[in-house]
């Protein structure tokens, strides 16, 4: 079917558009172009004579319209006359006629628009604000903006006048903003310029900074004072009713008690012509003495001595308040507090309890802290250690042992060897050792202020020969799939090294196995049943090698899920029922049964005489392993047939 | 093939009227105006009017406003001009006729007599 | 309303001769001028359209020109069956007939 198609369908003035045809038929004489929705000889653009090629003038012709050899029609410079529809008129060879009609129309290129106002300075909560798009434009559709947004929903907002007209009712200060108008039209869309609409607004009541309102003696009183206005409010200050000064602060250096009283800041705004006041009272106090912290026992010791700090100096009607580690008391039995407050005590110190340590005295204004005390806190010594940890040693090396024991005053230590005193020194030096140098060496630290001592033995072998070494474990029954073991091999000899075996085998790799601590120690993650192996290691140096004896790992595991042997299910009555129930579990589990969920007997085996039909039913197992924690359980169900009902039946254990 | 079909003659009495038909074929009936001329015995062609059969819109030579009526029949594809009033001054041949841009087709004219 | 006027109500010619018969419109008309041969007894006959196009099957010896108000529709080497009456008309505001140009022999 023949048609039209105009491109663009919407024309902007000026410009051009494309009538395009479509399905043209064959064969044709000649075609015409109307304006209009039908052939009119008074309104013809333009025809085209194929044979010839020439284009004929109609009445209706511009000079403004090109006809192409495909029949469609190029109309430049378009003018807003030019809206509405086209008919083409072709004409075939047999004269048999067609006609195909097409519109398009045209929309002027629109201007900017600019925003009118009926009130530049409306006055907030009072007066109406009436904008208006500019200029007035036919078929043109208005829009406006609120910083960049489009309108919000508000009653207070009416669009009118074809949306040309925005109305703001009862303005308020929130509607100081940008405000753009847009016209748009198919063709064009065009923005005004912002205007920012000015709402004279206040002043709001005034706010005066800052808050406190008291104060000590010989500080500076500065009040500001500010009140949400448009334009910016004009300030004037009173105390005790007594006009001071217009602006928005007010000074006064080094303030006595005297200065007390109400002070009363006032906002006017000269265009709304409206005034607001706020009144604070101010109170000065006299100054307070700094307080400081008294202690009855300024070297306690550990476990022993209690301490009383009593914050200084003693005021009636006064808060007193303590910090420790610059946090407030924490709630502890050993920590007392005197019914004034103004004495902390600490019962039985530790080392932990040095501070340090503040109080504070609170008056109207604020509090006053002292300066922090510390507690020299009398400890140890504790258990001295002795490092390195080896015990074994190869002749002809340097021994070198160190001792240190917490303590507070530090320690003073003294070595012994088998017994006999040695020297008064924190280390130990004895140089190219022999066998003879074999013994228990002990190391004491004494706290010579609170007298105590402590000592720690040591026994140091020296010798060509590495010893049989052994197995420590750190968990003598772990539970599969749940704990990990870590074997050491016992003792630490320097210049040695370690190995493990595993069933004869050495090691085998595995993402469960790790070595550490230079191979002496061995752990097992999420051990399993398989882990139940003898673990041996070995010791060697450049002199000899030692194995320790196996240690098998016991794994606890299980209960798995039981099997209930024999596995038939049918039975003929007056057979024996013999069930015995099997579970894989370390230790072995405790076993029970329940026939149709009746509990029954404890023991692995469930044996019932000559059944019956009535023995039908569901025949539970249930394992327990104390051990581990775990249960499990099996369900069987039994049919017992009446005799000779069903051949092939099981006769029974 | 485009035929239009007329009466050949008509006679009337002087103050009565007539309604002349022109039987429209070989073409869309309704996409084409028709036109209608009168020619007096040795005179010229005088543009009548013209009347559209898709909506009946019509265009009157402003001489035959009130004298001649013109309206379609589009189930019978006919065009009709009613002349009303008549007297010696409307005796002439009257032809239909759709004249276009390389489309022009002529009816044979109806001769109307006006007589008593 | 357009008048066009045709001058010469008859012109007088021979077989083989040239003849041009003219027609003026009352204002500018464009091209928008059709011309139209009318033998006795036989409706009128379309020669020309846009002033100077001649419709298919019509024998070259016709030939329109002009524009705008003077058009002039010229028979060259004139034929025995060219004796005929000839009518201009404008198609550019509604339909109007010049009153025609009998051409016959000398």
């Known amino acids: 079917k023949l048609t039209i198609e105009s491109t663009p369908f919407n024309v902007a003035e000026g410009k051009e558009v494309l009538l395009l045809v479509h399905n043209l038929p064959q064969h044709l004489f000649g075609y015409s172009w109307y304006k209009g929705e039908r052939v009119d000889g008074n309104r013809q653009i333009i025809g085209y004579v194929i044979g010839t090629q020439q284009a004929t003038p109609g009445p209706a012709y511009s000079g403004r319209e090109i006809i192409y050899p495909n029949a469609s029609l190029l109309i430049q410079n378009i003018i807003q006359n030019d809206t509405g529809f086209y008919t083409l008129h072709v004409i075939k060879s047999d004269l048999v006629n067609e006609e195909a009609t097409g519109q398009f129309r045209v929309y002027p290129e629109l201007p900017k628009p600019s925003i009118s106002s009926n009130n530049s300075k409306p006055v907030e909560d009072k007066d109406a604000v009436a904008f208006t798009c500019e200029p007035e434009t036919q078929d043109a559709t208005y829009l406006w903006w609120v910083n960049n947004q489009s309108l919000p929903v508000s009653p207070r907002l009416q669009l009118s006048n074809g949306n040309r007209t925005l109305t703001l009712f009862n303005v308020t200060r929130n509607d100081t903003a940008s405000y753009k108008c847009e016209t748009q039209n198919p063709v064009s869309a065009r923005r005004s310029d912002s205007v920012i609409l000015n709402v004279l607004y206040g002043p709001d009541a005034p706010t005066i900074s800052p808050l406190n309102t008291s104060y000590r003696s010989g500080e500076n009183l500065n009040l500001s004072c500010h009140a949400a206005s448009n334009p910016p409010a004009q300030y004037s200050w009173f105390v005790n009713g007594t006009f001071q000064q217009s602006t928005q602060e007010l000074f006064i250096p080094n303030i006595t008690v005297n200065n007390s009283g109400s002070y009363t800041c006032q906002a006017h705004n000269s265009d709304t012509g409206l005034n607001r006041t706020t009144v604070t009272t101010i109170t000065v106090y006299a100054e307070p003495p700094k307080p400081f912290i008294t202690s009855n026992n300024s070297n306690p010791v550990e476990d022993e001595d209690a301490v009383a700090l009593t914050c200084e100096p003693e005021i009636q009607n006064t808060t007193y308040l303590w910090w420790v580690n610059n946090q407030s008391l924490p709630v502890s039995p050993r920590l007392q507090l005197s019914n004034d407050n103004r004495t902390l005590t600490l019962l039985s110190v530790t080392r932990n309890d040095v501070g340090p340590y503040e109080c504070g005295i609170q008056n109207e204004l604020s509090v006053d802290h002292s300066d922090p005390v510390i507690l020299n806190v009398l400890y140890g010594p504790d258990d001295p250690t002795i490092s390195p940890s080896y015990t074994y040693y190869r002749p002809g090396v340097n021994l070198s042992l160190s001792c240190h024991a917490a303590s507070n005053p530090p320690a003073q230590y003294s070595w012994l060897i088998d017994g006999n005193i040695q020297q008064h020194t924190q280390e130990l030096f004895i140089s190219n050792i022999t066998e003879k140098n074999s013994g228990l060496y002990t190391c004491q630290a004494n706290n010579s202020a609170s007298g105590h001592s402590r000592t720690t033995v040591k026994t140091i072998t020296v010798s060509a020969e590495l010893p049989k070494p052994s197995i420590s474990s750190n968990n003598s029954k772990p539970v599969e799939d749940k704990d990990a073991v870590a074997f050491t091999c016992e003792p630490e000899a320097q210049n040695t090294t370690y190995l493990w075996w595993v069933n004869g085998q050495s090691l085998p790799v595995s993402p469960r196995l790790q070595l550490s601590n230079g191979n002496r120690t061995l752990t097992l993650f999420n051990v399993t049943r398989n882990d139940a192996r003898a673990y041996v290691c070995g010791i060697q140096n450049s002199v000899s090698a030692n194995r320790s004896d196996p240690v098998t790992l016991d794994v606890l595991y299980g209960p798995d899920t039981p099997i209930i042997s024999p596995p038939d299910s049918s039975y003929l009555s007056g057979a024996n029922l013999n069930l015995s129930c099997h579970s894989a579990s370390n230790p072995s589990p405790q076993y029970s049964w329940r026939i149709n969920g009746i509990p029954q007997q404890h023991t692995q085996v469930l044996f019932i005489a000559k059944i019956t039909p009535n023995n039908n039913g569901t025949y539970a197992c249930f394992v327990s392993n104390l051990a581990t924690g775990r249960n499990n359980s099996i369900v069987k169900s039994i049919t017992v047939s009446a005799s000779g009902t069903s051949p092939g039946l099981s006769a029974g254990a | 093939q485009v035929q239009l079909q007329q009466p050949g003659a008509e006679l009337v009495k002087p103050g009565a009227s007539v309604k002349v038909s022109c039987k429209a074929s070989g073409y869309t009936f309704t996409s084409y105006w028709m036109h209608w001329v009168k020619q007096r015995p040795g005179q010229g062609l005088e543009w009548i009017g013209r009347i559209h059969p898709s909506d009946s819109d019509t265009n009157y030579n402003q001489k035959f406003k009130g004298k001649a009526t013109l309206t379609v029949d589009k189930s019978s594809s006919t065009a009709y001009m009613q002349l009303s009033s008549l007297t010696s001054e409307d005796s002439a041949v009257y032809y239909c006729?759709?004249?276009?841009?390389?489309?022009?087709?002529w009816g044979q004219g109806t001769t109307l007599t006006v007589s008593s | 309303d357009i008048v066009m006027t045709q001058s010469q109500k008859f012109m007088s010619t021979s077989v083989g001769d040239r003849v041009s018969v003219t027609c003026k419109a009352s204002q500018n008309v464009g091209t928008n001028v059709a011309w139209y041969q009318q033998k006795p007894g036989q409706s009128p006959k379309a020669l020309i359209y846009s002033a100077s196009y001649r419709y298919s099957g019509v024998p070259d010896r016709f030939t329109g020109s002009g524009s705008g108000t003077d058009f002039t529709l010229t028979i060259s080497n004139v034929q025995s069956e060219d004796l005929a009456e000839y009518f201009c008309q404008q198609y550019y505001s509604y339909f109007t007939f010049g009153a025609g140009t009998k051409l016959e022999l000398k």
């Open positions: 006729a759709i004249v276009e841009w390389m489309f022009d087709y």
